[in-house]
């Protein structure tokens, strides 16, 4: 049996930050699990890991330098990403592994979420402030 994962098809990261919710066909309550977010069509870059082990507190880390946090729901993990670059626009895949109790479970590969990172654009001030043109 495989866990099914649902993700938004696309998200826009304004202010270089985004929240990506991974929804699972499995209740993570009282389970030992490892939820992770991967970047790229080949999922080559592990962006963030959220590890749950029965306790109230989730352990969050990134081996690839991404600034992330997480939040656990009964059947979801939301990844919060900060300080994204425009060139980190890509497709991101949620992955879930349940280690305990047996049997070990993981997910069918999801369709992923395209995260479009919008750059910060500064609008130049008009030389002569006045009524704006339509």
């Amino acid at each position: 049996n495989k866990i099914l994962v649902k993700q938004s098809p696309m998200l826009v990261a304004y202010d270089n930050a985004v929240n990506l919710s991974c929804k699972y066909s499995y209740n993570l309550f009282s389970r030992e699990f490892r939820a992770s977010l991967h970047k790229g069509l080949d999922s080559a870059v592990e962006v963030c890991v959220v590890y749950g082990n029965y306790s109230q507190q989730l352990q969050v880390y990134s081996k690839t330098g991404f600034n992330c946090d997480g939040k656990l729901g009964n059947e979801s993990v939301t990844f919060y990403l900060q300080n994204l670059y425009v060139n980190q626009t890509d497709i991101y895949f949620c992955k879930i592994e349940v280690m305990y109790p047996p049997p070990y479970l993981d997910n069918e590969k999801s369709n992923g979420t395209i995260i479009h990172v919008k750059g910060k654009h500064l609008c130049p001030s008009p030389l002569f402030p006045g009524p704006s043109k339509p």
């Epitope: 969050v60 600034n67 946090d69 997480g70």
Partner: antibody, heavy 120, light 107 residues
Framework: EVQLVESGGGLVQPGGSLRLSCAAS????????MHWVRQAPGKGLMWVSR????????SHADSVRGRFTISRDNAKNTLYLQLNGLRAEDTAVYYC?????????????WGQGALVTVSS | EIVLTQSPATLSLSPGERATLSCRAS??????LAWYQQKPGQAPRLLIY???KRATGIPARFSGTGSGTDFTLTISSLEPEDFAVYSC?????????FGQGTKVEIK
């Protein structure tokens, strides 16, 4: 006035344990991420651990993951760091620091520090 | 992780002189860089955040510039209380990292 006061430091043998506390006052403790940052003698600062505002998530530096545990009691306005499996290289002054829950890792107030010495 | 290199290690100056401290990152940290002041036996104090914004209560003689990989902290005219160790810190990438510090001492 924002105040962070660490306690619980001391001399411990290699392999031993210690629990540091940080009592917070002068601000809404439950609204801030809290951190531990350490400074070994004659060395620079090094980030150790963090916990988010409600205590639901935590992160640790690679060098302490699996040995140190950060926790908080928002009812008591207190931050904790449980140090297990201590090594000589963990000898340092340990500071607690607060960070806004939007910037995560920008430390705007620090405590005076607690000295942890690991030696046989 | 991102390595921050500060230079010089020590700066010997007299009160009233201008101090220029450098912090270089091993890769871009955008403008997510802070500067802290630390005196012996005291807690570090946030001076500058986001590369150029002065923290609350910090005198105007402290200023920060730079973005990407090269950053500078300038103290326009040193006061006796400014002799201390100054550290930079990035929060762009995880984990956050600090420079090794620059000591500003009285000449």
């Amino acid at each position: 006035e924002v105040q962070l006061v660490e306690s619980g430091g001391g001399l411990v043998q290699p392999g031993g344990s210690l629990r540091l506390s940080c009592a917070a006052s002068g601000f809404t403790f439950s609204s801030y991420w809290m951190h531990w940052v350490r400074q070994a003698p004659g060395k620079g600062l090094m980030w150790v651990s963090r916990i988010n505002s409600d205590g639901s998530t935590a992160s640790h530096a690679d060098s302490v993951r699996g040995r140190f545990t950060i926790s908080r009691d928002n009812a008591k306005n207190t931050l904790y760091l449980q140090l297990n499996g201590l090594r000589a290289e963990d000898t340092a002054v340990y500071y607690c620091a607060r960070a806004d829950s939007t910037t995560w890792y920008e430390f705007d107030f620090w405590g005076q520090g607690a000295l942890v010495t690991v030696s046989s | 992780e991102i390595v921050l290199t500060q230079s010089p290690a020590t700066l010997s100056l007299s009160p009233g002189e201008r101090a220029t401290l450098s912090c270089r990152a091993s890769q871009s940290v955008s403008s997510y860089l802070a500067w802290y002041q630390q005196k012996p036996g005291q807690a570090p104090r946030l001076l500058i955040y986001d590369a150029s914004k002065r923290a609350t209560g910090i005198p105007a003689r402290f200023s920060g510039t730079g973005s990407g990989t090269d950053f500078t902290l300038t103290i326009s005219s040193l006061e006796p209380e400014d002799f201390a160790v100054y550290s930079c810190q990035q929060r762009h990438n995880w984990p956050p990292t600090f420079g090794q510090g620059t000591k500003v001492e009285i000449k």
